[in-house]
């Protein structure tokens, strides 16, 4: 960057090189060039010469003043016009940054996705700071008082093998940058209470011809957790409002859930689960589409993006890919 150049003088910023966005700042340039009494001192921001708010302080020093500086980053350098020199002589340069102190981190959440071997902690960092902001995640055992700290720029994955102070912990997040430091409230966790079961996946759907046609959704999870509660939500793709069905589930076999749906309508389904009585849910599964047949039943080979119709007794939809859910991060 600009800071690596060889200087023939000195450039500095008041109040500091990193300052709060919107502040008034002064940039000072002091020449120390052999055999040169500068006729004029020039300031450049991002390579463009500044024309206004420059004050000559003495023979070797000038000041550039900015009101309400709002740029997150700028490269400043200054030059001197020396007698008998055809070109301007470079004095020095500096990268400057403006931004905000961190907000208090809130909504600290820690979960263990089954089989991951990690505890994943996330938080709401608040408003954008524009400057380098680091987060320290503190994990303190309520049983041994031992504390581990993890330095990160965003979320953190902590190996569950490193959590050797029992099952109960306090977790909190400290945010710090050049403009300030803030700290979250402490979150109390029990490792057994924050496990999110292995993802539930809808594998296929079929509509069976009966007096009243019914649609069966087949879904499963690789979880080893015994007591699991799940929700399946579904709606016609033209609707805004979801219908929700609740299940107490035992995943020793593939689940079959029955729905009585309107004919000849494209529906979308999603499922999510949690360990019964615990706090955190899985994110909703990928969107699964199924179109119900007209009153005369028909068959589809897949109804994910493309609907291919054949005559027959059932309509089946098979999950062949993944579409991103509309709110995958919904774990609370």
């Amino acid at each position: 960057g600009i800071t690596n150049i060889n200087c023939s003088g000195h450039i500095w910023v008041e109040p500091a090189t990193i300052f709060k966005m919107g502040m008034n700042i002064s940039i000072y340039c002091q020449a120390a060039i052999k055999n040169c009494q500068p006729r004029k001192l020039h300031f450049y921001k991002n390579g463009i010469k500044e024309r206004f708010q420059i004050t000559r302080i003495n023979k070797t020093t000038a000041r550039l003043w900015y009101k309400n500086f709002l740029e997150p980053h700028a490269s400043m350098y200054c030059t001197a016009e020396c007698p008998k020199h055809f070109q301007e002589t470079l004095i020095c340069g500096k990268d400057i940054s403006s931004g905000y102190p961190p907000d208090i981190p809130d909504e600290v959440t820690c979960v263990i996705y089954e089989y991951s071997g990690n505890m994943t902690c996330t938080w709401n960092a608040g408003k954008l700071t524009y400057i380098d902001t680091k987060y320290v995640v503190h994990v303190k055992s309520l049983e041994t008082e031992e504390e581990q700290q993890y330095l990160t720029s965003s979320y953190i994955n902590i190996s569950t093998d490193s959590l050797q102070g029992g099952k109960k912990y306090l977790v909190w997040v400290q945010a710090a940058n050049a403009l300030g430091m803030e700290e979250s409230k402490q979150l109390q966790i029990h490792l057994d209470d924050i496990v999110i079961p292995s993802a539930a996946v809808i594998s296929r759907a079929e509509t069976i011809n009966a007096t009243v046609p019914k649609t069966i959704i087949y879904w499963d999870s690789q979880t080893t957790i015994e007591k699991v509660s799940c929700e399946m939500r579904y709606k016609a793709t033209t609707n805004q409002t979801w219908n929700v069905k609740e299940f107490d589930t035992n995943f020793t076999y593939v689940q079959q859930s029955e729905f009585y749906l309107e004919p000849n309508i494209k529906y979308v389904f999603q499922v999510r689960c949690q360990e019964t009585g615990k706090r955190y849910w899985q994110p909703w599964s990928s969107l699964f589409f199924h179109k119900t047949p007209e009153t005369v039943p028909q068959v589809t080979s897949k109804a994910f993006q493309h609907d291919t119709w054949n005559s027959g007794l059932t309509v089946a939809s098979i999950s062949t890919g993944h579409l991103t859910s509309d709110n995958r991060g919904d774990i609370g």
């Epitope: 503190h138 309520l142 031992e146 504390e147 700290q149 306090l170």
Partner: antibody, heavy 121, light 112 residues
Framework: QVQLVQSGAEVKKPGSSVKVSCKAS?????????MCWVRQAPGQGLEWMGC?????????YYANWAKGRVTITADESTSTAYMELSSLRSEDTAVYYC????????????WGQGTLVTVSS | DIQMTQSPSSLSASVGDRVTITCQAS??????LAWYQQKPGKAPKLLIY???KLAAGVPSRFSGSGSGTDFTLTISSLQPEDFATYYC??????????????FGQGTKVEIK
């Protein structure tokens, strides 16, 4: 068994700085640990100054009153912690202790012998 | 800012007496509290940590209790060597930017 050996007594002028060292033996420097500093003015109670956390990264924490005046550092190569106090005033006359449990807990099983710092013109 | 308030500031007692010192935190510190004994000219000595756990080598007449905000140090039968000053200390977290002191003001136990 952790042992903490502090530098000797100091007499300082107001406005100057003092740097007290604390050499630790018996700490596993591959593990996480806190090293903290506590002072005690004559006839007064214990006053926490700050701590340094040494682990996968280094973090320092200071009492509100000590911010900007106290700097705590650690040199892992010599197993030594330092506490520097600047802009000394007469009310900084106290015995300064380093303290740790040799791990990442904040209670102190082990204390240095104390360093008397006298601030006088 | 967690503040630690210790009471009483001093007390007079006789050998064999049961002595109780209390410490109150201005916010929940769970069981993260330690008690120290200090004699004149000496460094403090850890007695109790995690509110109720006895440090190595500390006689069983010392005990600690409490959690959250209210804590107690009890000496069941005061011995001559127990006349000293006692301090509580919160050991929850020091990373909070606003901490002033983590110790209580101290309780001096004197001979009646």
């Amino acid at each position: 068994q952790v042992q903490l050996v502090q530098s000797g007594a100091e007499v300082k002028k107001p406005g100057s700085s003092v740097k007290v060292s604390c050499k630790a033996s018996g700490i596993d420097f591959n593990s996480n640990y806190y090293m903290c500093w506590v002072r005690q003015a004559p006839g007064q109670g214990l006053e926490w100054m700050g701590c340094i956390y040494v682990g996968s990264h280094v973090n320092t924490y200071y009492a509100n009153w000590a911010k900007g005046r106290v700097t705590i550092t650690a040199d892992e190569s010599t197993s030594t912690a330092y506490m520097e106090l600047s802009s000394l005033r007469s009310e900084d006359t106290a015995v300064y202790y380093c303290a740790t449990s040799g791990s990442s807990v904040l209670y102190f099983k082990f204390w240095g012998q104390g360093t008397l710092v006298t601030v006088s013109s | 800012d967690i503040q630690m308030t210790q009471s009483p500031s001093s007390l007079s007692a006789s050998v064999g007496d049961r002595v109780t010192i209390t410490c109150q935190a201005s916010e929940n510190i769970y069981s993260f509290l330690a008690w120290y004994q200090q004699k004149p000219g000496k460094a403090p000595k850890l007695l109790i940590y995690s509110a109720s756990k006895l440090a190595a080598g500390v006689p069983s007449r010392f005990s600690g209790s409490g959690s959250g905000t209210d804590f107690t140090l009890t000496i069941s039968s005061l011995q001559p060597e127990d006349f000293a000053t006692y301090y509580c200390q919160q050991t929850n977290r020091y990373s909070n930017p606003d901490i002033y002191n983590v110790f209580g003001q101290g309780t001096k136990v004197e001979i009646k």
